[in-house]
Interface confidence: medium
Amino acid sequence: AAIIPQSSACPNTEAKDFLQNVKVNLKVFNSLGAKVSSRRPSDYLNRSTSPWTLHRNEDPDRYPSVIWEAQCRHQRCVNAEGKLDHHMNSVLIQQEILVLKREPESCPFTFRVEKMLVGVGCTCVASIVRQAA
Amino acid sequence: AAIIPQSSACPNTEAKDFLQNVKVNLKVFNSLGAKVSSRRPSDYLNRSTSPWTLHRNEDPDRYPSVIWEAQCRHQRCVNAEGKLDHHMNSVLIQQEILVLKREPESCPFTFRVEKMLVGVGCTCVASIVRQAA
């Protein structure tokens, strides 16, 4: 995947060069203000009928350096009695995210954009029953 | 989140320039190979006991330009009979993501990294009953 400028507002920008090492003004901006970083983790992971655990995925050479990845606790869902319901499955909801990776030993700092697929939480779905022909 | 305009892990880097011009390789690397981009949208949004809809959030000056945001279809969860269960709530699972925003009219191209909080899907949780004192 590549980020192609929508317009050619910049003259003489060759596409093949543009994507390699563009000098960009990399300002980091939080569109939700401090609200994002300070937001408390929700308790949905314990209260859900398809509960999950969070595992720390840590890489000091990446931004964000700490990413929490969800894993469903059970293959089945938990019913109102707290028992596993064998007609219902816990499934992982995944999200594709962008991360910045620092190119090793680079001064001035050089970053590359990477895509990652991370588990965010779990949801409960009815099992699909395969009918014999 | 906070940015402080001073520093230097790289020698001879003037504080004021530090965040100004860093190189970013704007080719987007898939850390999970083709698995990420080619993955089929799942049908969990319809099969879940807490179904959701996806709304298109589009911005041509952003990468990714299209982000699909989830919204829970109902306040309650759907039971095995397809009826809404008033003891169970559908709740939105949110994820903080990074996006690249192009600064308008910028030459050379200037991007800023923004954080966004997006809804990814819904899960079903037991309603919290508030007890009267």
Epitope: E58, P60, V66, F109 | L19
Partner: nanobody, 119 residues
């Protein structure tokens, strides 16, 4: 959950000394550069000092060079700031912050500890 807890602030006379501490948890402390930053009353955040993950290099803002010393103990997951020859203009809330690959960009910092320099 990443947590940073500062301590050691207080009221001190000009020319006096204080030692700030920061206890870290929820991440691999020894893998990250760490910072002290401060915010004087009515002012913006100001970078004070940085120490690399292994303690091999330190960096200081010009305003504190020669007076402040940053150090760390990776075994104890702790960061320190020894402040000598304190001046009235050092009065601020001091925060420790976890470094990221983005220069001087912080997602995580503590609740802060107030240092007041006054006679």
């Amino acid at each position: 959950e990443v947590q940073l807890v500062e301590s050691g602030g207080g009221l001190v006379q000009p020319g006096g000394s204080l030692r700030l501490s920061c206890a870290a948890s929820g991440f691999t402390f020894s893998s990250y550069g760490m910072y002290w930053v401060r915010q004087a009353p009515g002012k913006g955040l100001e970078w004070v000092a940085k120490i690399e993950q292994d303690g091999s290099e330190e960096y200081y803002a010009d305003s504190v060079k020669g007076r402040f010393t940053i150090s760390r103990d990776n075994a104890k997951k702790s960061l320190y700031l020894q402040m000598n020859s304190l001046r009235a203009e050092d009065t601020a809330v001091y925060y420790c912050a976890k470094g990221e690959i983005l220069p001087l960009y912080f997602d995580y910092w503590g609740q802060g500890t107030l240092v007041t320099v006054s006679s």
